[in-house]
């Protein structure tokens, strides 16, 4: 079955710092999404090959793509407190694939002592059952930070 | 068992708008993508509109800037703001479930939309 | 645009019969494509996905195949509750577009 590798799962990085979140399948996709997770989940680009990307409002000017849809590295730039949270990659082929979830969390300058990641993926068991369609879970509250505001989700 | 009830049809002079409503149950609203096809009075289907799970949005130019498709993860209803609407929008429109970007799995029995002065 | 074409607009058969509803695509749409059942009152499901997967609840008599561009849906023991249109639909790429239907009726 078709699988996401994503990868880290989790980093901690100081406001304005940028993220690398690579999305690695074995192909045959119709594109990827990467989303970001909490209970209203919040697409945050989709990709597809030949296609110009959709990227949402808050994230404009400060997404950038490297690779193709079957191994593809988003790097997100000038991170904000608000963007801390658990972010998935959705591959979209036959059928959902999704990948494990990247932890996310974007501190204080002078507080990145106070929070670290650990070495554990996101635990999948605080996952809930996938959609019927779906290779692996959809991960709606992987986190267990607080959700950060929401932002618009306009393409 | 899944279900999903259009409603908000009518009447309606071109030029006008409406606000279509999709009551959805028996799924987890917030985990899927959502769609609205039309019937045309000559039982063409026509994809009018898509939303992810994660809130992006996509239309056919048919459609675009005059169509807008939103949904309300919290009550468990997804919409269709019509506006500048022409005698061609006249259709059926149906909301469906769109378990993989486009393949639709569960559709709704449909709310009747007939544009005409 | 990716155009969806079912020649066949109406077809005939009695009970029993098999048959085969034939769908093209103006472009290869590799093997993204949807097989959904109208009756005449409306009602819409889905029937096959991804060329030949059967969607849950359907019954096996209903198969679905091709590849490139020539798509099939195939009734292997025409019963009376088949009696519907049948559209074809690709979701390879947006907008997602529909064939013209192809009603099937009782001789």
């Known amino acids: 079955a078709q699988e996401v590798q994503q990868s880290p799962h989790c980093t901690t990085v100081p406001v304005g710092a940028s993220v690398n979140i690579t999305c690695s399948t074995s192909g045959g996709l119709r594109g990827i999404y990467l989303r970001q997770l909490g209970p209203q989940p919040q697409d945050i680009i989709y990709y597809e090959d030949g296609v110009v990307p959709t990227t949402d409002r808050r994230f404009r000017g400060r997404i950038d793509f490297s690779g193709s849809q079957d191994n593809l590295t988003i790097t997100m730039h000038r991170l904000q407190l608000s963007d801390t949270g658990t972010y998935t990659c959705q591959a979209i082929t036959e059928v959902n694939v999704y990948g494990s979830g990247t932890l996310v969390l974007v501190t204080e300058e002078q507080s990145q002592g106070w929070h670290r990641c650990s070495d554990a993926p996101p635990r999948a068991s605080a996952l809930p059952a996938p959609p019927t369609g779906s290779a692996l879970p959809d991960p709606q509250t992987a986190s267990a930070l607080p959700d950060p505001p929401a932002a618009s989700a306009l393409p | 068992e899944v279900q999903l009830v259009e409603s908000g049809g009518g009447l309606v002079k071109p030029g006008g708008s409406l606000k279509l409503s999709c009551a959805a149950s028996?799924?987890?609203?917030?985990?899927?993508?959502m769609s609205w096809v039309r019937q045309t009075p000559e039982k063409r289907l026509e994809w009018v509109a898509s939303?992810?799970?994660?809130?992006?949005?996509y239309y056919p130019d048919s459609v675009k800037g005059r169509f807008t498709i939103s949904r309300d993860n919290a009550r468990n209803i997804l919409y269709l703001q019509m506006s500048s609407l022409r005698s061609e929008d006249t259709a059926m429109y149906y909301c469906?479930?769109?378990?993989?970007?486009?393949?639709?799995?569960?559709w709704g029995a449909g709310t009747t939309v007939t544009v005409s002065s | 645009d990716i155009q969806m074409t079912q020649t066949t607009s109406s077809l005939s058969a009695s009970l029993g019969d098999r048959v085969t509803i034939s769908c093209s695509a103006s472009?290869?749409?590799?093997?993204?494509l949807n097989w959904y059942q109208q009756k005449p009152d409306g009602t819409v499901k889905l029937l096959i996905y991804?060329?030949?997967s059967l969607h849950s609840g359907v019954p096996s008599r209903f198969s679905g195949s091709g590849s490139g561009t020539d798509y099939s849906l195939t009734i292997s023991n025409l019963e009376p509750e088949d009696i519907a249109t049948y559209y074809c639909?690709?979701?390879?790429?947006?907008?997602?577009?529909f064939g013209g239907g192809t009603k099937l009726e009782i001789k």
């Open positions: 469906a479930r769109d378990e993989v970007r486009g393949y639709l799995d569960v």
């Open positions: 028996g799924l987890t609203f917030s985990s899927y993508a």
């Open positions: 939303i992810s799970s994660g809130g992006f949005t």
């Open positions: 472009q290869g749409i590799s093997n993204y």
């Open positions: 991804y060329t030949s």
């Open positions: 639909q690709q979701y390879s790429k947006l907008p997602y577009t």
